[in-house]
């Protein structure tokens, strides 16, 4: 019994005066607490307690379950204890099989003994299986067996408390250890789509997948810059131990324009947090926006190829696309395809391939596209650059020499006189009249130019050259003159191509 100074309150004394008492099953337990200020006896086993207000605790026929700590307390709150073992060969262990361990922490297997004199108090694996090599434990006959530093690998480990009694191994009921993992990384979060585009009234539904080591991970959908509680539905799965997946689905059954914004899926555990966002855009009706990838005014040389390319955004998805020229629809020579294979793609490309264009094929080429809500179109003005062609070259009755040329861009006509038989005509002659004529062809066709000179200016034999040229090339026509006396005769004109 503890010694105390005179005048100070002292703890109660217990008879029998020993710390441990062993009785046989069926025998009497008689414990006496002596103290002028006696308050109560408390009995405790497996962390459960019973009280008795009598100063003598009597159990007439002891059972194994009477094993435990008996504590006497006085009015000063001072106490004294005795531990009683009720030896029962048929019940060597008292057990509470709830067994949870937190990773990296210790946990107690609650299997206190009813007989302290048995030997080799330890843990054993079920069905004769060995315990993990790194499993360390400390036995305490009055409390149970403490497993040190629980590992994740011990999850669902089946155990027995074990003792040797009279040379034989005796096992307790089985314990199954459930390990709660420590969070050693932030949750992994992902979202079904990064952006959504909807029309008013359509349903918005987005799923966030949260992965972590246990279901203790917290997750929620939040609207950025808003405290409004969002309606979520959950599905969850355990893909084996410590591989937990939750799907949190956020739904707005009839989206409105003002629902547009950024939605965040947030998850956290004791290690940290992670989040992922998705953007919702709600439009009052669908749209199509067309973006030409080349200038809408196109110049192309005769015989060359050109591709008319547009990109366009269409929501909902495009239903009809066509390319038109001169009120005719192309059935081939064009292709239309999505800009990306992404599920949320709304951008498309359309290409019209024009090959070996002729001068007569200039004009307006129109791309039309429609969806269930809107139509849109874009026009390309295609000009075909052609080398000048001399349409007519005549000596008129009034003595004028006239040259008419067509081409695109508009040709320029120059006149030259070559005296005698010289091949090179260098002396230029100024025209009397130059006119641009209206073409009878399409508005994007060749431009026609007419130029005239007065032949009376020529006094010698020679050749007159009419040269028509533009950026693409040049063409010449020749008028040969010979004088007989005072008469001037026109020899048949001819043209020469000059590259």
């Amino acid at each position: 019994q503890p010694s105390v100074s005179p005048g100070e309150p002292s703890p109660p004394s217990i008879h029998p005066g020993k710390s441990d008492l062993i009785v046989r099953v069926g025998d009497e337990i008689r414990l006496l607490c002596t103290d002028p200020g006696f308050v109560k006896w408390t009995f405790e086993i497996l962390d459960e307690t019973n009280e008795n207000k009598q100063n003598e605790w009597i159990t007439e026929k002891a059972e194994a379950t009477n094993t435990g700590k008996y504590t006497c307390t006085n009015k000063h709150g001072l106490s004294n204890s005795i531990y009683v073992f009720v030896r029962d060969p048929a019940k060597l262990f008292l057990v509470d099989r709830s067994l949870y361990g937190k990773e990296d922490n210790d946990t107690l297997v609650r299997c206190p003994l009813t007989d302290p004199e048995v030997t080799n108090y330890s843990l054993k694996g079920c069905q004769g299986k060995p315990l993990p090599k790194d499993l360390r434990f400390i036995p305490d006959p009055k409390a149970g067996i403490m497993i040190k530093s629980v590992k994740r690998a011990y999850h669902r480990l089946c155990l027995h408390c074990s003792v040797d009694q009279e040379g034989k191994s005796v096992l307790s009921e089985k314990f199954i250890l459930k390990v709660r993992p420590a969070f050693k990384a932030v949750p992994v979060v992902s979202v079904s789509k990064a952006s959504y585009l909807l029309r008013e009234g359509e349903e918005f539904t987005v799923t966030c997948t949260i992965k972590d080591v246990s279901s203790s991970v917290y997750s929620t959908w939040k609207r950025e810059n808003s405290q409004t509680k969002l309606q979520e539905k959950y599905n969850s799965w355990h893909h084996g131990d410590f591989n937990y997946e939750r799907q949190a689905t956020l739904t707005i059954s009839s989206a409105r324009v003002n629902d547009s914004g950024v939605f965040m899926c947030y998850a956290n555990n004791t290690f940290g947090s992670a989040n992922v966002t998705t953007t919702l855009e709600v439009v009052d009706k669908g749209f199509i926006n067309i973006f030409p990838m080349i200038n809408t005014t196109v110049f192309v040389n005769d015989g060359e190829n050109v591709d008319l390319i547009v990109e366009y955004e269409a929501f909902p998805k495009p239903e009809h696309q066509q390319w038109i020229y001169m009120n005719r629809t192309f059935t081939d020579k064009w292709e239309d395809y999505p800009k990306s294979e992404n599920e949320s793609n709304i951008r498309y490309v359309s290409e019209l391939h024009l090959t070996r264009l002729k001068g007569t094929e200039g004009g307006t080429y129109t791309f039309l596209v429609s969806n269930s809500d809107v139509n849109a179109a874009i026009a390309f003005n295609v000009y075909v650059n052609t080398k000048p062609e001399i349409l007519t070259y005549d000596r008129l009755v009034n003595g004028m020499l006239q040259c008419v040329a067509a081409g695109f861009p508009e040709p320029t006509i120059d006149w030259y006189f070559c005296p005698g038989t010289e091949q090179r005509c260098s002396a230029s002659v100024l025209p009397v009249d130059v006119q641009t004529l209206n073409s009878s062809g399409p508005p994007f066709g060749k431009l026609v130019v007419q130029s005239s000179i007065d032949s009376s200016a020529f006094k010698h034999n020679g050749t007159v050259e009419c040269k028509a040229y533009n950026d693409v090339g040049k063409t010449s026509a020749y008028f040969n003159f010979a004088f007989k006396g005072n008469n001037k005769e026109q020899i048949h004109p001819h043209t020469l191509f000059t590259p």
């Epitope: 405790e44 962390d47 459960e48 057990v95 099989r97 089946c158 199954i176 246990s214 203790s216």
Partner: antibody
Framework: QVQLVQSGAEVKKPGASVKVSCKAS????????MHWVRQAPGQGLEWMGV????????SYNQKFKGRVTMTTDTSTSTAYMELRSLTSDDTAVYYC??????????WGQGTLVTVSA | EIVLTQSPSSLSASVGDRVTITCRAS??????????MHWYQQKPGKAPKLLIY???NLESGVPSRFSGSGSGTDFTLTISSLQPEDFATYYC?????????FGQGTKLEIK
């Protein structure tokens, strides 16, 4: 003898919070897990979560995550369950239950929480 | 989560009858041959009371007319001879895996 005594009935407005207490006696409070279970009128039992012995770690049913907090005061051997952002669907009897030897061996008498505008 | 489905949802019987209630789990609740399945009885206005733990163990103080059996996903609560005080609602519950779940309940009424 183990006893779990819960706080009295509560009437709350939608959007408010409620904190239900569960005072334990007859055992070492810090040695046992405490679970919370609720039962809506005429409905079945629904597990809300658990506060684990010793560490005070919690594990909640995802249905209540973000709205529920389970705590203990070891000095008074009392467990608490707070539920926030109440709606009429939260009208129920709330029970605390001590886990012993793998099962819910002891239950509180229940606390009726009524959520009404 | 593990879903528990009880059948029947309600049952009319007479005193002395033998009654069987079943509980089917959406996945096994067994570990090393131990079934983490329990049965509770609840009377109106009262807290649930444990009857059977770990599928087949009778809780202390519960009459022996109650018994439990089963393993894996299929479990049964049997009352061998109904007594007047047995008319109540019965629930199965699993604590093999969080979130712990209960069956929807079986209401046992007097015929």
């Amino acid at each position: 003898q183990v006893q779990l005594v819960q706080s009295g009935a509560e009437v709350k407005k939608p959007g408010a919070s409620v904190k239900v207490s569960c005072k334990a006696s007859g055992y070492t409070f810090t040695s046992y897990n405490m679970h919370w279970v609720r039962q809506a009128p005429g409905q079945g039992l629904e597990w809300m979560g658990v506060i684990y012995s010793g560490s005070g770690d919690t594990s909640y049913n995802q249905k209540f995550k973000g709205r529920v907090t389970m705590t203990t005061d070891t000095s008074t051997s009392t467990a608490y369950m707070e539920l926030r952002s109440l709606t009429s669907d939260d009208t129920a009897v709330y029970y605390c239950a001590r886990e012993r030897d793998t099962r819910f061996g002891n239950w509180g008498q229940g606390t009726l929480v009524t959520v009404s505008a | 989560e593990i879903v528990l489905t009880q059948s029947p949802s309600s049952l009319s019987a007479s005193v002395g009858d033998r009654v069987t209630i079943t509980c089917r789990a959406s996945e096994s609740v067994d570990i090393y041959g131990e079934s983490f399945m329990h049965w509770y009885q609840q009377k109106p206005g009262k807290a649930p009371k444990l009857l059977i733990y770990l599928a087949s163990n009778l809780e202390s103080g519960v009459p022996s007319r109650f018994s439990g059996s089963g393993s894996g996903t299929d479990f049964t609560l049997t009352i061998s001879s109904l007594q007047p005080e047995d008319f109540a609602t019965y629930y199965c519950q699993q604590n093999n895996e969080e979130p712990y779940t209960f069956g929807q309940g079986t209401k046992l009424e007097i015929k």
